[in-house]
């Protein structure tokens, strides 16, 4: 707690401007007035305060907004924002996505701190869902963002929204939120014609089930073995090797270099070792010819 | 690019005058407060002053407080540094440095540095 | 003023070590603490500010950590080009003051 102290004569500050710059603590304290300052919140960052000077300026909001900043200082804290804790945060109602695009461009190169986590947690929130416009600027600060996100949180995302995803904001999403981004990246690209329907839905494969990769394996998608190591294993199973062959075209020859690793290594131990010799690869460890599959998943059903 | 490019070091003599520049280049110079720091040689930084965005606010250390002058010419995208008085202790290389500005307030970039001589 | 002290004043290291660099300050500074790399006749750069954010274009084997008084300045393997001499300074209070650095050589 700073100490009440008077200004002194000629001191008291008329604008927040860069005479402040060497004032100390105490001066600062006693001459700045909150509601000036309120007012005046864009100039600060145009001064380098010194991080004991934001501390007391910090602490006179503080004082003036007990309940919480209004939105009309928020959007000119700049980089005051840095000095705020997740428990101040938490106090703030923010609804415009220009406030959201301000305070993100001050922590701009920065990892997501808890603060900003904590400030995109209360915006979203405060909105509802997470619509396209705020989708797009938080991908465009944070392009991990969307994979942060719990399948739960991810419900609520519109698939309208799904326009604004990127290939690389997927980079990080494990197969649990492909389950639940892909049936709503199908339905946002549903009115594509082939080609540029794959395009756009590639990113999101992880997610699919087996009956829309054999649909795919009809449409001479050529897809590249990255995406199919992302497939979910269990959609890959079932999987013929004629349609793993269409489905994959020309770049079926890098099965070979795959053989070991999943999902490729189990799709291998299910197919006939008869029909993998058609692909000429020199793919081992499937079924020998003349043994009988039996599928005990299928049977246990119908006992 | 953003670029600070720093003339007029040289040999003086004790009780003589020197005049630094640093010419500034790549950013908006008027938005940015700037200062000169030195280091004498085999030793570390020192802060020596200080000049806001305007010019109207000033900051120099005790050492050179009364001796030294910065100034800026925003027109010019220019800064300045008069020594008065020289120390065979104000022996340095000085740099000047750009001040950070709305997100964060480090010293970035910095001039390449003139050396400053005092001996008789 | 607040005084900054580094430690060591001399690390010799092989490449590919860890170097682990040393800050600290005669009072409390919170995150206010940045480095900079000064190589023989060159200026310094900034490396780390607010204690742990990498400046643009430094490479993520650097890292800072700490608060309050002590801080770290990690440099998880080194390069032969991280052969120099690293320097912190707080922005905590009037005046700005800088540690008297720590020169990392080959060993």
């Known amino acids: 707690e700073v100490e009440k102290t008077a200004c002194p004569s000629g001191k008291k500050a008329r604008e927040i401007d860069e005479s402040l710059i060497f004032y100390k603590k105490w001066e600062l304290e006693a001459c700045v007035d909150a509601a000036l300052l309120a007012t005046q919140m864009d100039r600060v960052n145009a001064i380098p305060f010194t991080y004991e000077q934001l501390d007391v300026l910090k602490h006179k909001l503080d004082e003036l907004y007990p309940q919480g900043y209004p939105e009309s200082v928020i959007q000119h804290l700049g980089y005051l924002f840095l000095k705020m804790s997740p428990e101040d945060i938490r106090k703030w109602n923010v609804t415009s996505l220009e406030t959201l695009k301000a305070l993100l461009e001050v922590n701009k190169g920065h990892e997501m701190s808890p603060q900003v986590a904590t400030l995109i947690d209360r915006f979203v929130k405060g909105r509802g869902q997470l619509d396209k416009d705020t989708l797009d600027t938080l991908t465009a600060f944070y392009p991990g963002y969307l994979c942060s996100l719990s399948p739960e949180e991810l419900s609520s995302v519109p698939p309208s929204s799904i326009w604004a995803v990127r290939p690389q904001d997927l980079d990080t999403c494990d197969p649990r939120q492909l389950d639940v981004l892909y049936p709503k990246a199908r339905l946002a690209f549903q009115n594509m014609n082939g080609s540029e329907y794959f395009v756009k839905i590639q990113s999101f494969l992880g997610g699919a089930p087996t009956e829309d990769l054999k649909a795919l394996s009809q449409q001479n998608v050529s897809m590249d073995l990255a995406t199919f190591m992302k497939l979910r294993t269990d959609a890959v199973l079932p999987l013929t090797v004629a349609e793993v062959q269409k489905l994959l075209g020309p770049h079926v020859e890098g099965l070979k270099a795959e053989e070991r690793h999943r999902p490729v290594r189990d799709w291998i131990l299910r197919q006939r070792q008869d029909d993998l010799d058609t692909l000429g690869l020199g793919l081992q460890g499937g079924i020998p010819n003349g043994y009988l599959v039996l599928d005990l998943s299928m049977q246990e059903a119908l006992s | 690019q953003v670029q600070l490019v720093q003339s007029g070091g040289g040999l003086v003599k004790p009780g003589g005058s020197l005049r630094l520049s640093c010419a500034a280049s790549g950013f908006t110079f008027s938005d940015y407060y700037m200062s000169w720091i030195r280091q004498a040689p085999g030793k570390g930084l020192e802060w020596v002053s200080y000049?806001?965005?305007?010019?109207?606010?000033?900051y120099y250390a005790d050492s050179v407080k009364g001796r030294f002058t910065i100034s800026r010419d925003n027109a010019k995208n220019s800064l300045y540094l008069q020594m008065n008085s020289l120390r065979a202790e104000d022996t340095a290389v000085y740099y000047c440095a750009r001040d950070g500005y709305r997100t964060h307030n480090w010293f970035d970039p910095w001039g390449q540095g003139t050396l400053v001589t005092v001996s008789s | 003023e607040i005084v900054m002290t580094q430690s060591p004043a001399t690390l010799s290291l092989s490449p590919g070590e860890r170097a682990t660099l040393s800050c600290r300050a005669s009072q409390s500074i919170g995150n206010s603490l940045a480095w900079y790399q000064q190589k023989p006749g060159q200026a310094p750069r900034l490396l780390i500010y607010?204690?742990?954010n990498r400046a643009t274009g430094i490479p993520a084997r650097f890292s800072g950590s700490g608060s309050g008084t002590d801080f770290t300045l990690t440099i998880s393997s080194l390069e032969p080009e991280d052969f120099a001499v690293y320097y912190c300074?707080?922005?905590?209070?009037?005046?700005?003051?800088f540690g008297g650095g720590t020169k990392v050589e080959i060993k």
């Open positions: 300074q707080h922005r905590y209070s009037w005046p700005l003051t």
């Open positions: 000049i806001s965005s305007s010019g109207s606010t000033i």
């Open positions: 607010d204690v742990s």
